[in-house]
């Protein structure tokens, strides 16, 4: 039978129901988010019941980890002031129906926030009754009932192995510690080119075959397990196993990486072109213009041979470049007349050339005296 509630005391908190006021309490949802939509309405109760309400105690949530130990936890921070709540438990309708005190509390910031029960204290197929109580206010107590077979969370699958059954068929195998036949599994796999996982449910046999494998792609597999449906009806899955890989390491890169590479190359190329243009314009500004032979005649004519005027070199710099040796003018003719051009012969200058173009003055070095 159900155990009676622990003794009550008369200390009561707030006379809110008499005023018709609702108590809005923030509670934590399983994913850790706050749920403020759950208003704890303090409404009409049976005639003999309390005329004054007590604050509700936090809910207890229990999980049985691989049937090795069980953690029952509560949100200790929901209490209006730090309170070391106590936990008692028993099993309904069984040889284990004696009320037990928690012998191993879990703490959060030095306040009790859970209880850990060891394997010998876990009886999966008997109704587990857990009672949370405020020791300073024993009337504040809450008794919950739980079906532990629906609260089992197995360890993640281990030792994933892949075997090639044929040229295009792969088989994935794995192990689970202790709970093999009680578990169902979920296999997920994808290639480097896939955006999302493909998943496949697998029964207690813990093996999975992939009938058509592309040898050019690299595959990743992972597995998780759940205590369902043969031995219980648990909703929570285990953690994912460590992934295992199969296939060509030289396969085409991930499309995201490929796209990233393309962007980097494009941006890099643009950057290089812009840099070169900057260097070009900088050189254009700082370096003297060097004429092509094609327009040299026009320049010489226009500036009457004044090199510094059209070259962009300042007058001072031009003067400092003046040589301190004597120059010898070399005349250049278009087509030499028969009998040879001026300057030909043994004493002729080596600068004498047959050219249709004007050439810059030809210098003969004269040693300093």
């Amino acid at each position: 039978m159900l155990k009676p509630s622990l003794p009550f005391t008369s200390l009561l908190f707030l006379q809110l129901p008499l005023l018709g006021v609702g108590l809005n309490t923030t509670i934590l949802t399983p994913n850790g988010n706050e749920d403020t939509t759950a208003d704890f309405f303090l409404t009409t109760m049976p005639t003999d019941s309390l005329s004054v309400s007590t604050l509700p105690l936090p809910e207890v949530q229990c999980f049985v980890f691989n049937v090795e130990y069980m953690n029952c936890t509560w949100n200790s921070s929901s209490e209006p002031q730090p309170t070391n709540l106590t936990l008692h438990y028993w099993y309904k309708n069984s040889d284990n129906d004696k009320v037990q005190k928690c012998s191993h509390y879990l703490f959060s910031e030095e306040i009790t926030s859970g209880c850990q029960l060891q394997k010998k204290e876990i009886h999966l197929y008997q109704t587990f009754v857990v009672q949370l109580q405020d020791p300073r206010e024993p009337r504040r107590q809450a008794t919950q009932m739980l079906k532990l077979q629906n609260l089992v969370i197995p360890w993640a699958p281990e030792n994933l192995t892949l075997h090639k059954l044929s040229e295009s068929q792969l088989e994935l195998n794995w192990n689970n510690r202790f709970l093999n036949h009680c578990l169902e599994h979920l296999v997920q796999y994808r290639t480097d080119w896939d955006h999302s996982w493909t998943e496949q449910s697998v029964d207690y046999r813990h093996k999975f075959s992939l009938p058509s494998v592309d040898g050019q792609k690299r595959y990743t597999f992972r597995v998780r397990s759940r205590f369902n449906p043969l031995c219980g009806s648990a909703q929570h899955w285990s953690e994912w196993s460590h992934p295992i890989h199969w296939g060509s390491n030289t396969s085409k890169e991930n499309p995201f990486l490929f796209a990233l590479e393309a962007v980097v190359i494009s941006v890099g190329s643009m950057g290089l072109i812009i840099s070169l243009l900057c260097v070009y314009f900088w050189l254009e500004r700082t370096m003297p213009r060097i004429p092509t032979l094609k327009n040299l005649e026009d320049l010489v004519t226009e500036y009457h041979g004044n090199f510094s005027a059209w070259s962009g070199v300042s007058k001072g710099l031009a003067e400092s470049l003046q040589p301190d040796y004597s120059e010898r003018l070399c005349l250049v003719s278009e087509i030499p007349p028969k009998g040879g051009a001026l300057g030909e012969g043994p004493g002729a200058s080596p600068c004498n050339q047959h050219s249709p173009y004007w050439a810059p003055p030809c210098y003969t070095l004269k040693p300093e005296t």
Epitope: T29, D39, F40, E59, T143, Q144, M145, L146
Partner: nanobody, 126 residues
């Protein structure tokens, strides 16, 4: 404001059956723990049955195998099917609810419930 209204009580011969209904207004019950309690004249209120919104149902030893708790979220109601009624089942039956975060929470303690109905009388004659 949440309102629970029980119906379906009455006078029945021993061995007979009744189906109690509890309809809610002002709140959706689909994520609440729900319970049935009863109080016989001169006795304390006692737990009869409870249900978590995840679907786990629990019964007091005295009614196990005879009573069945069910809920219909579409109708925002819960039910208690009572078979093989005995004179000791005579009491006022109350429906109660509590908002809960976890699908597995089911309470057998009356002070864990936040809102209650006014009750419906069940009398079993021998």
């Amino acid at each position: 404001q949440v309102q629970l209204v029980e119906s379906g009580g009455g006078l029945v011969q021993a061995g007979g059956s009744l189906r109690l209904s509890c309809a809610a207004s002002g709140r959706t019950l689909s994520r609440d723990a729900m319970g049935w309690f009863r109080q016989a004249p001169g006795k304390e209120r006692e737990f009869v049955a409870a249900d978590s919104w995840g679907g786990d149902t629990f019964y007091a030893d005295s009614v196990e195998g005879r009573f069945t708790f069910s809920r219909d979220n579409a109708k925002n109601a819960v039910y208690l099917q009572m078979n093989s009624l005995q004179p000791e089942d005579t009491a006022v039956y109350y429906c109660a609810g509590a908002p809960t975060s976890f699908a597995t929470t089911a309470y057998s303690s009356s002070n864990s419930y936040r809102y209650w109905g006014q009750g419906t009388q069940v009398t079993v004659s021998s």
